[in-house]
């Protein structure tokens, strides 16, 4: 989990240090002079002792994946398409997900994390079948895979924070025009 | 408003090259992959590749890689589709297009208003 | 991958309903919920009507909407207009390798 500290890395404050801070929750972003800080809330410590910590400082991938996660989604419910996760569309059908029948060698060949590759990039993502996954691009490989974001988010955290990262706008409160960017044709 | 603005029509002899430009406006370019689509006269369309702005990272149709190039600069918001030497057949209006969300795989709901290219000797 | 497979013409009288098919394969249609409509007018850039098979973009009718069954995706237009005449294109993902692929069009006449 992460550590709180001023400036210093992990291992420069556990060695100057008894106590361990462990990071209960990532609450906000902020980027500071083209520095990413996080604020954080600390197990055991009220909101008042929250603090705003350097990205490279942290080290608890899970939570500020997570919280990225809750970002997007939230970003997406904020949109102007009537404030729906979803545009106005009929009810998906689900049923049509199940996976056509392939050749016996195809439907055998691994895919996605047990393909044993090291994940490079997101290159995408979709919920279209219910569930949000990702499109993810391997290292020393062409083909990409759709993989869970869930999985993804546990095996790969730094990969998904990058995708988020770069995918979404922060801190620059949505004009007129950016809020109703994703409703023109 | 979201914008692309595509450099205008061009004429030009096979062998020669050219490159075409694609500028967004109205949003964050580096958030959105660009997608270039190609329509030869009284044909459909055909996708060519797309390019992530804020890396210049590209995918490329098998039917288009090592015939065309893709690039960025950020710097300008404007993306590129260029050719070293053109032939005739390469003679379409092309469309540079931006998806509705930031990470949508492979449909795209903003378009630029196409650039006519004809090759011809 | 090889285009996806349209009707080349389709047609239908005011206010009546018309689907387009869109057929592909296991490896693009059949393997992901990711098929995408156009409509395009003469002269015009193409539109987004229905994208991840069934979604609609805002400002787009609720008289179109979008399915799949197996390989074959579907466009459907109910009550139709005078200004639903024009070019229709599906797309779909197909593999990181081929990335998207476009069906050949369908002309869409209103009687």
């Known amino acids: 989990m992460g550590k709180k500290q001023n400036k210093k890395k992990v291992e420069e404050v556990l060695e100057e240090e008894e106590e361990e801070y462990v990071v209960e929750k990532v609450l906000d972003r902020r980027v500071v002079k083209g520095k990413v800080e996080y604020l954080l809330k600390w197990k055991g410590f009220s909101d008042e002792d929250n603090t705003w910590e350097p990205e490279e400082n942290l080290d608890c991938p899970d939570l500020i994946a997570e919280f990225l996660q809750s970002q997007k989604t939230a970003h997406e419910t904020d949109k102007s398409e009537g404030g729906k996760r979803k545009a106005d569309s009929d009810s998906e059908d689900k049923g049509e997900e199940s996976k056509p029948k392939k050749k016996k060698e195809e439907s055998e060949k691994p895919r996605g994390f047990a393909r044993g590759l090291e994940p490079e990039r997101i290159i995408g993502a979709t919920d279209s079948s219910g569930e949000l996954m990702f499109l993810m691009k391997w290292k020393n490989s062409d083909e990409a895979d759709l993989v869970p974001a869930k999985e993804a988010n546990v095996k790969c955290p730094q990969v998904v924070i990058s995708f988020y990262e770069e995918r979404l706008t922060w801190h620059s409160y949505p004009s007129e025009d950016d809020d109703k960017k994703d409703d023109k044709n | 408003a979201v914008q692309l603005v595509q450099s205008g029509a061009e004429v030009k002899k096979p062998g020669e090259s050219l490159r075409i430009s694609c500028k967004g406006s109205?949003?964050?370019?580096?958030?959105?992959?660009i997608s270039w689509v190609r329509q030869m006269p009284g044909k459909g369309l055909e996708w060519m590749g797309r390019i992530d702005p804020s890396d210049s990272y590209t995918n490329y149709s098998p039917s288009f890689q090592g015939h065309v190039t893709i690039s960025a600069d950020k710097s300008i918001s404007t993306a590129y589709l260029q050719w070293s030497s053109l032939k005739t057949s390469d003679t379409a209006m092309y469309y540079c297009?931006?998806?509705?969300?930031?990470?949508?795989?492979?449909?795209?709901?903003?378009w630029g208003q196409g650039t006519l290219v004809t090759v011809s000797s | 991958a090889s285009a996806l497979t349209q009707p080349a013409s389709v047609s239908g009288s005011p206010g009546q309903s018309i689907t387009i098919s869109c057929t592909g394969t296991?490896?693009?249609?059949?393997?992901?919920?990711?098929v995408s409509w156009y409509q395009q007018h003469p002269g015009k850039a193409p539109k987004l009507m229905i994208y991840e098979g069934s979604k609609r973009p805002s400002g787009v009718s609720n008289r179109f909407s979008g399915s799949k069954s197996g390989n074959t995706a579907s466009l459907t237009i109910s009550g139709l207009q005078a200004e639903d005449e024009a070019d229709y294109y599906c797309c779909s993902y197909a593999g990181s390798s081929t990335f998207a692929v476009f069906g050949g069009g369908t002309k869409l006449t209103v009687l």
């Open positions: 109205g949003y964050s370019f580096t958030s959105y992959w």
């Open positions: 296991s490896s693009d249609v059949g393997s992901y919920n990711l």
């Open positions: 297009a931006r998806p509705l969300q930031t990470y949508s795989i492979a449909s795209v709901g903003h």
